[in-house]
Interface confidence: medium
């Protein structure tokens, strides 16, 4: 059966820092979205391996990756305050597939002391409703998926 | 006004290295991915490299792949192209390019805009 | 890599004349392309990208359309300063690729 491994379950960060979310996926795959959910679940990436990447406006500069679309980390720089909040790791598929949500936490640095991250992963309650078919972009066929592009992380 | 200069360029012999710098004015460097395009003499555009904003995430085309290095230090507000290993199909004009900033769902790397007025690499022995 | 094949590579116009170029991609890029102006030694400038958007400051008479895989730039009529070679060029897939442009030159 399809499944998203999404880890870290919960991750604290100072403002202006940085927090990786990896989304491990089994079985055929489009692309990963990375949704910030909330009363209005919002799309922050589509990656597709050799696919140019998208980037909502709001993360434009701030967003890394690497990997491929199976096994893919996300990096998440110059964290606000405002980027608080539950992400999870959706695998666009023959259905949509989630991944349990990462609970990011942009602290001031001093409060920092005053937050602490459980091993449960964030409440099932959070997760959104899977969004309409009509709501995602055109997708290739798997057939005309092409390969991984050369992408190198630098130290 | 956004504005890049580049520099660095010049004759270089088949095998030798040259670094390319792109000095960006105008806008807020460490915001955006920056570009390489190059076009030989009389020929048409061709995409060399890609950075992304952090500097953490490159992309190659692959005649350039592991001769080339795209860099940026974003306290300097500057763009670099390390260019080892030389060819005589190198020789072109080498401009850097901004990504462009239009405020809808938009590209990791996207549309090129604005480019600086270009650098001449020569490579001949 | 995918493919942009742009025609015809040359066109003789007058001003006021109505201009359509073509750029046909080898596999769907979507609605991810753009045009490039670029004057003789001079930086190439964007026209229009995702398709059928004018950037900042392109004058209206530009204008383009298309999908999938055929792609046209319409200039309304030509005026002095539109005579240049256009590019077009795709964002959909690694390697960013851009077509073998078309000369608008004066008859």
């Known amino acids: 059966a399809q499944e998203v491994q999404q880890s870290p379950h919960c991750t604290i960060a100072p403002v202006g820092g940085s927090v990786n979310i990896t989304c491990s996926t089994s079985g055929e795959l489009h692309g990963i979205y990375l949704r910030q959910l909330g009363p209005q679940p919002q799309n922050i990436i589509y990656y597709e391996d050799r696919v140019v990447p998208t980037t909502d406006k709001r993360f434009q500069g701030r967003i890394d990756f690497s990997g491929s679309q199976d096994n893919l980390t996300i990096t998440m720089h110059h964290l606000q305050p405002s980027d608080t909040g539950t992400y999870t790791c959706q695998a666009v598929t023959e259905i949509n597939v989630y991944g349990s949500g990462t609970l990011v936490l942009v602290t001031e640095e001093q409060s920092q002391g005053l937050h602490r991250c459980s091993d449960a992963p964030p409440t099932g309650s959070a997760l959104p409703v899977p969004p309409t078919t009509s709501a995602l972009p055109a997708l290739p066929t798997a057939s005309a998926l092409p390969a991984l592009p050369t992408a190198s992380a630098l130290p | 006004e956004v504005q890049l200069v580049e520099s660095g360029g010049g004759l270089v012999q088949p095998g030798g290295s040259l670094r390319l710098s792109c000095a960006a004015s105008?806008?807020?460097?460490?915001?955006?991915?920056m570009s390489w395009v190059r076009q030989a003499p009389g020929k048409g555009l061709e995409w060399v490299s890609s950075i992304s904003a952090s500097g953490a995430t490159t992309f190659y085309a692959d005649p350039v792949k592991g001769r080339f290095t795209i860099s940026r230090d974003n306290s300097k507000k500057t763009l670099y192209l390390q260019m080892n290993s030389l060819r005589a199909e190198d020789t072109a004009v080498y401009y850097c390019?901004?990504?462009?900033?239009?405020?809808?769902?938009?590209?990791?790397?996207?549309?090129?805009?604005?480019w600086g007025q270009g650098t001449l690499v020569t490579v001949s022995s | 890599e995918i493919v942009l094949t742009q025609s015809p590579a040359t066109l003789s116009l007058s001003p006021g004349e109505r201009v359509i170029l073509s750029c046909r991609v080898s596999?769907?890029?979507?609605?991810?392309l753009a045009w490039y102006q670029q004057k003789p030694g001079q930086a190439p400038r964007l026209l229009i990208y995702d398709t059928s958007n004018r950037a900042t400051g392109i004058p209206a008479r530009f204008s383009g359309s298309g999908s999938g895989t055929d792609f046209t730039l319409t200039i309304s009529s030509l005026e002095p300063e539109d005579f240049a070679v256009y590019y077009c060029?795709?964002?959909?897939?690694?390697?960013?690729?851009f077509g073998g442009g078309t000369k608008v030159e004066i008859k």
């Open positions: 390019a901004k990504d462009q900033d239009f405020d809808i769902l938009t590209g990791y790397l996207n549309w090129f805009d604005p």
């Open positions: 596999q769907s890029v979507s609605s991810y």
């Open positions: 105008g806008f807020t460097f460490s915001r955006y991915a």
């Open positions: 060029q795709q964002r959909r897939n690694w390697p960013l690729t």
